[in-house]
């Protein structure tokens, strides 16, 4: 769809003749007549097959036309078209006389054709002007003429409609070739495509308008390239969506079981070397002159009795001193100056001869030690107690305190935490150093098997077109993250965007 | 061939929220090709454009309707739907679904045969 | 809010044309769709795009829009064609309907 303009600029009849050349009374009261027609080798006569049109009086003999197209007049006159441009045109422009007001061509004697000017060739769309001259015996004819395309038609032959918009079925202008151009932000075919914000992750992000960036199930953050973790995890992170993966020193579902108390307590007090024994559990080796579970008391060097035969100890600022009684000697009072006849083993200990009666030892009875048997046996020498028991020399009965998981005369033994049968649903227990596990059947999960859960949502394989499939333990549902080129729950659609209907 | 199918109830009391659903079958609603919409019109009068979707889930409303509109979208069941609340005599009409072209003029191809409500207590 | 005048009514004889306008601020700027809807049935699609036919709509159907007017043209009307016909274009983001044109058959 187009428009053929053309544009009278100046008439010339000096003598003010018709074409018969008989003259005008008074003067040539001028109007034309324009027939525009397919290509024709020779111009005939026959219908105006691209349209016709015709002027007012414009002037009488000779004149010039002026230019009305701002002030909505008639030149340049307008032959629209509703076709594609053939690129090629034939013009008759007649100019003739009125005598009177009816300008019809049935209102006019024949001979008042002034003159008839035929010209064709080839003229192609464009905004520039052809002038054109035109000259007979009596007549001169200046006018200049184009083809341009009509509002929203665009191309060399003003076949291809186009009309901007943004709006949800496009975001785009025309290019001069009738071709889209899209709008900052916008791609596709109709530019209905926006761009996300740049870095936005090509699978696990999208967006429905320019310059953001939407996640999809699964993903976090500004660019949607990071994975959200199994819902309740707490010290573990995630390269797929709903992972929990334990951080160094955790373990559990959860990641919320501490397998390095150590580290994260720093439970051995005075420097003591602590080594992990267990969930939540520890060992602290003390450093000398230190005792208790985490190393908390100090030891006097005289708590452990370094002086034998019933020597005093008395502690001295770089150590301890031993003082003997009457018939010992040495550091610990370790050496012995009295020999079986002095009767030196007490408690009901026997004395034995040694070295030829130069020297004895003594054999003790039952809960007595010593060279002598002077000394009640104390009990916590040996470290009896197991399991970072505390040991307690005094007390008729109990010897050792215990930690919390453990019992026995030694703390030798596990409370059984399994005892109470806590795991629900048919759930296996477990015991630990400290605590218990449950190992639960399908279908059932959680610290005590508690939590009915479905079986895997991706067992059943969901996902179409090689989509990764996530469960969401959270919700029992499973999640598609679809590969590039395929959308829906279950990635089974490819994207596309074919024209529904064809050009 | 394409063919939508509205559904709902036929009667809404004042002040309650109308809900219809249109079942798309013989095409895919996850089509870029198309949005679906919901156009209406009450008896004796002309059509009315209430709103459109995306398959993505990309919603555009009459601003006449706006507040009170939601439609969405079901790519599992192949359905969209219509939910108007709020609603007063003035909602009383036939409810069309149909199938509107993604692209250039998004002329409506398809319609749903429609379904009457009424609003009345 | 954008608005789409059309003439309540249009009467034609069996076998001539008749035009059915379709009045809006800029419309030739924008794609024109019409519908005809008979008593009773659904609206259909008779053109889209300005000018375009959907398959199965008669030839005698045919569109233009320029300026502010498209027009709707029925040449060699039949008593089928007798029924109600809008028009549709869409304003920014918003479907617009024309008021309705009764096509009656003489």
């Known amino acids: 769809s187009g428009v053929f303009q053309l544009q009278l600029q100046e008439f010339i009849n000096e003598r003010g003749v018709l074409a018969s050349g008989r003259p005008c009374e008074p003067g040539c009261r001028t109007f034309f007549r324009v027939c525009l027609k397919h290509f024709q080798a020779v111009v005939s006569p026959g219908p105006c097959t691209f349209g016709t049109v015709s002027t007012p009086v414009l002037g009488t003999n000779s004149f010039a036309v002026r230019d009305d197209s701002s002030g909505g007049g008639r030149n340049p006159l307008q032959l629209p078209f509703n076709f594609t441009w053939p690129g090629t045109f034939s013009l008759i422009i007649e100019a003739w006389h009125a005598p009177g007001d009816d300008l019809r061509p049935e209102a006019l004697p024949p001979d008042a054709l002034i003159s008839k000017i035929a010209i064709q060739g080839s003229l192609a769309v464009g905004q520039n002007w052809l002038l054109d001259e035109q000259t007979s015996t009596l007549t001169r004819l200046r006018y200049s003429y184009r083809v341009i395309c009509s509002d929203n038609y665009y191309g060399d032959n003003c076949s291809r409609l186009c009309k901007k918009r943004n709006d949800h079925f496009g975001h785009y202008v025309c290019q001069p070739d009738g071709n889209l151009s899209c709008l900052p932000g916008w791609t596709g075919e109709y530019c209905q495509q926006p761009i996300c914000l740049s870095g936005c992750h090509e699978q696990n992000g999208y967006c429905s308008k320019p310059a953001e960036c939407l996640c999809r199930p699964g993903w976090q953050g500004r660019l949607c390239n990071e994975c959200i973790p199994h819902n309740g995890c707490r010290h573990g992170t995630c390269s797929t969506p709903w992972q929990c993966t334990c951080d160094e020193g955790w373990g559990g579902l959860f990641c919320d079981q501490d397998l390095n108390y150590c580290t994260h307590h720093s439970p051995c007090k005075n420097g003591a070397t602590c080594s992990n024994s267990g969930q939540r559990s520890y060992t602290c080796t003390c450093r000398p002159g230190y005792t208790g579970v985490d190393c908390e008391l100090e030891l006097s060097e005289c708590d452990s009795n370094p002086c034998r035969n019933g020597g005093s100890c008395k502690d001295q600022e770089d150590g301890y001193h031993c003082l003997c009684p009457p018939g010992y000697y040495g550091l610990h009072c370790e050496h012995s100056t009295l020999s079986c006849a002095d009767s030196p083993c007490f408690n009901g200990g026997s004395c034995r001869e040694r070295n030829q009666g130069a020297n004895y030892a003594c054999e003790c009875p039952p809960n007595f030690t010593g060279s002598n048997c002077e000394k009640k046996v104390d009990r916590c020498t040996s470290n009896p107690c197991a399991n970072g028991g505390q040991c307690l020399n005094r007390g008729p009965s109990r010897m050792c305190r215990c930690r919390p998981g453990f019992t026995g005369t030694y703390c030798e033994l596990h409370v059984s935490d399994c005892a109470r049968n806590p795991c629900a649903h048919g759930g296996t227990c477990h015991d630990l150093e400290n605590g218990l596990m449950c190992t639960c059947p399908a279908g059932f999960s959680g610290r005590r098997c508690e939590v009915r859960t479905s079986i895997d949502a991706c067992a059943s394989s969901p996902c179409f077109n090689r989509a990764t499939c996530y469960t969401d333990l959270s919700t029992d549902t499973f999640v598609c993250n679809c590969p590039y080129g395929f959308v829906g729950s279950r990635c089974e659609f490819p994207v596309g965007l074919p024209p529904s209907f064809p050009w | 061939e394409v063919q939508l199918q509205e559904s709902g109830p036929g009667l809404v009391k004042p002040s309650e929220t109308l809900s219809l659903t249109c079942t798309v079958s013989?095409?895919?609603?996850?089509?870029?090709?198309?949005?679906w919409g919901w156009i209406r019109q009450p008896p004796g009068k002309g059509l009315e454009w209430i709103g459109d979707?995306?398959?993505?889930?990309?919603?555009y409303y009459n601003p006449s309707l706006k507040s009170r509109v939601t439609i969405s979208v079901d790519t599992s069941k192949n359905q969209f739907s219509l939910k108007l609340s709020s609603v007063t005599a003035a909602d009383t009409a036939v409810y069309y679904c149909a199938r509107e072209e993604a692209i250039l003029g998004g002329g409506s191809d398809y319609w749903g045969q429609g379904t009457l409500v009424t609003v009345s207590s | 809010s954008y608005e789409l005048t059309q003439p309540p009514s249009v009467s034609v004889s069996p076998g001539q044309t008749a035009s059915i306008t379709c009045s809006g601020q800029?419309?030739?700027?924008?794609?024109a769709s019409w519908y005809q809807q008979k008593p009773g049935q659904s609206p259909v699609l008779v053109i889209y795009e300005d000018s375009k036919r959907p398959s199965g709509i008669p030839e005698r159907f045919s569109g233009s829009n320029s300026g502010d007017t498209a027009t709707l043209t029925i040449s060699g009307t039949q008593p089928m064609d007798e029924a109600d016909y809008y028009c549709q274009a869409w304003d920014r983001d918003t479907g617009v309907f024309g008021y309705g044109t009764k096509v009656t058959v003489l």
């Open positions: 979707i995306y398959y993505t889930g990309s919603t």
């Open positions: 800029r419309l030739g700027d924008k794609y």
């Open positions: 013989g095409g895919s609603i996850s089509s870029s090709s198309y949005y």
